[in-house]
């Protein structure tokens, strides 16, 4: 399966939208930095079959969608930007789902690596716990926004490697 060029463009647009979402100066939030333990190894893409890598990317985007779909999120971010954000994430989820369907029967390995999916879910659980502990403060959301932007940048690298694998 070829991830369409539109998927790469959508990923870039997602990052641009997130960059515009900031409401307060991040300089006031330095002391709120937190180690969420981004699962770098799940995005290195070396040990994965293609279908498994796609399922990890899908899980990350799905979890991001869930995180920013909460009422706490809606109360924090600009509604117009959030709607654009949802649209781009939805587009990426559709692309990845279509890709996963094409991979059925192509590879001998399972379509998803359950351990990797769980690792990604636990990563987002840590982010949610942090927001809860910080009472969804503006700075906590700024830190989370920066973290998600970073994880999207790193996942874009995996997508690029997948494209080169064709």
């Amino acid at each position: 399966c070829d991830l369409p060029q539109t998927h790469s463009l959508s990923n870039r647009r997602t990052l641009m939208i997130m960059a515009q979402m900031g409401r307060i100066s991040p300089f006031s939030c330095l002391k709120d930095r937190h180690d969420f333990g981004f699962p770098q190894e799940e995005f290195d893409g070396n040990q994965f079959q293609k279908a498994q890598a796609i399922s990890v990317l899908h899980e990350m985007i799905q979890q991001t969608f869930n995180l920013f779909s909460t009422k706490d999120s809606s109360a924090t971010w600009d509604e117009t930007l959030l709607d654009k954000f949802y649209t781009e994430l939805y587009q990426q989820l559709n692309d990845l789902e279509a890709c996963m369907m094409q991979e059925v029967g192509v590879e001998d390995t399972p379509l998803m690596n359950v351990d990797s999916i769980l690792t990604v879910r636990k990563y987002f659980q840590r982010i949610t716990l942090y927001l809860t502990e910080k009472k969804y403060s503006p700075c906590a959301w700024e830190v989370v926004r920066a973290e998600i932007m970073r994880s999207f940048s790193l996942s874009a690298n995996l997508q690029e490697r997948l494209r080169r694998k064709e």
Epitope: A19, G22, S25, P26, F27, C29, L30, K31, D32, R33, H34, D35, F36, E142, V143, A146, E147, M149, R150, S153
Partner: antibody
Framework: EVQLVQSGAEVKKPGESLKISCKGS????????IGWVRQMPGKGLEWMGI????????AYSPSFQGQVTISADKSISTAYLQWSSLKASDTAMYYC??????????????WGQGTLVTVSS | DIQMTQSPSSLSASVGDRVTITCRAS??????LNWYQQKPGKAPKLLIY???SLQSGVPSRFSGSGSGTDFTLTISSLQPEDFATYYC?????????FGQGTKVEIK
């Protein structure tokens, strides 16, 4: 390969203006902040200020607020430090360094080679 | 502003010695402390970040510890290339501040 390349040494007279630069390459320039650090001859390191190149938001040390201006042009991945009226006490080595912003990652992990500014009449 | 105080300001040691440099913050900075090495005419180099994380490419003889207000940089066995000036820096809040430096000289 991540690199921060600074502009060359400058010799200026008191009262003159100056703008030095720091060009980033090998990474996403807007994903990191750029900080500026002063080192006067034979002295220690002093943090001057920082910029987020994605939106040009800045923060300054109180000691340098109003004395210098930090700016950036993300289209050419370059940050700047400028003076409108130099003093002899501005004579120093100036370093730029990248900072991960709010991400949990190493602070000031890459530095420019430094720009020596000499102000003398 | 958060003041950072290093001690000693200079020390003399021999190759193979264990060297310890301390840094004290004027208020709690959790673990938001970095250590840098600087050699004459060169830019500083990051050694340790977040108090105890070893920066990629830095030899394992360097280690950092501490949290709150008191921090330590340890060089387990001093090598000839380690003679330099070392700075601590807090990254807890703006304005970022550095210690005054510790010069490690050859005995």
């Amino acid at each position: 390969e991540v690199q921060l390349v600074q502009s060359g040494a400058e010799v200026k007279k008191p009262g003159e203006s100056l703008k030095i630069s720091c060009k980033g390459s090998g990474y996403s320039f807007t994903s990191y902040w750029i900080g500026w650090v002063r080192q006067m001859p034979g002295k220690g390191l002093e943090w001057m200020g920082i910029i987020d190149p994605s939106d040009s938001d800045t923060a300054y040390s109180p000691s340098f607020q109003g004395q210098v201006t930090i700016s950036a042009d993300k289209s050419i991945s370059t940050a700047y430090l400028q003076w409108s009226s130099l003093k002899a006490s501005d004579t120093a080595m100036y370093y730029c360094a990248r900072h991960p912003g709010l991400n949990w990652a190493p602070d000031f992990d890459y530095w420019g080679q430094g720009t020596l500014v000499t102000v003398s009449s | 502003d958060i003041q950072m105080t290093q001690s000693p300001s200079s020390l003399s040691a021999s190759v193979g010695d264990r060297v310890t440099i301390t840094c004290r913050a004027s208020q709690s900075i959790d673990g938001a402390l970095n250590w840098y090495q600087q050699k004459p005419g060169k830019a500083p180099k990051l050694l340790i970040y977040f108090a105890s994380s070893l920066q990629s490419g830095v030899p394992s003889r360097f280690s950092g510890s501490g949290s709150g207000t008191d921090f330590t940089l340890t060089i387990s066995s001093l090598q000839p290339e380690d003679f330099a000036t070392y700075y601590c820096q807090q990254s807890f809040d703006f304005p970022l501040t550095f210690g005054q430096g510790t010069k490690v000289e050859i005995k």
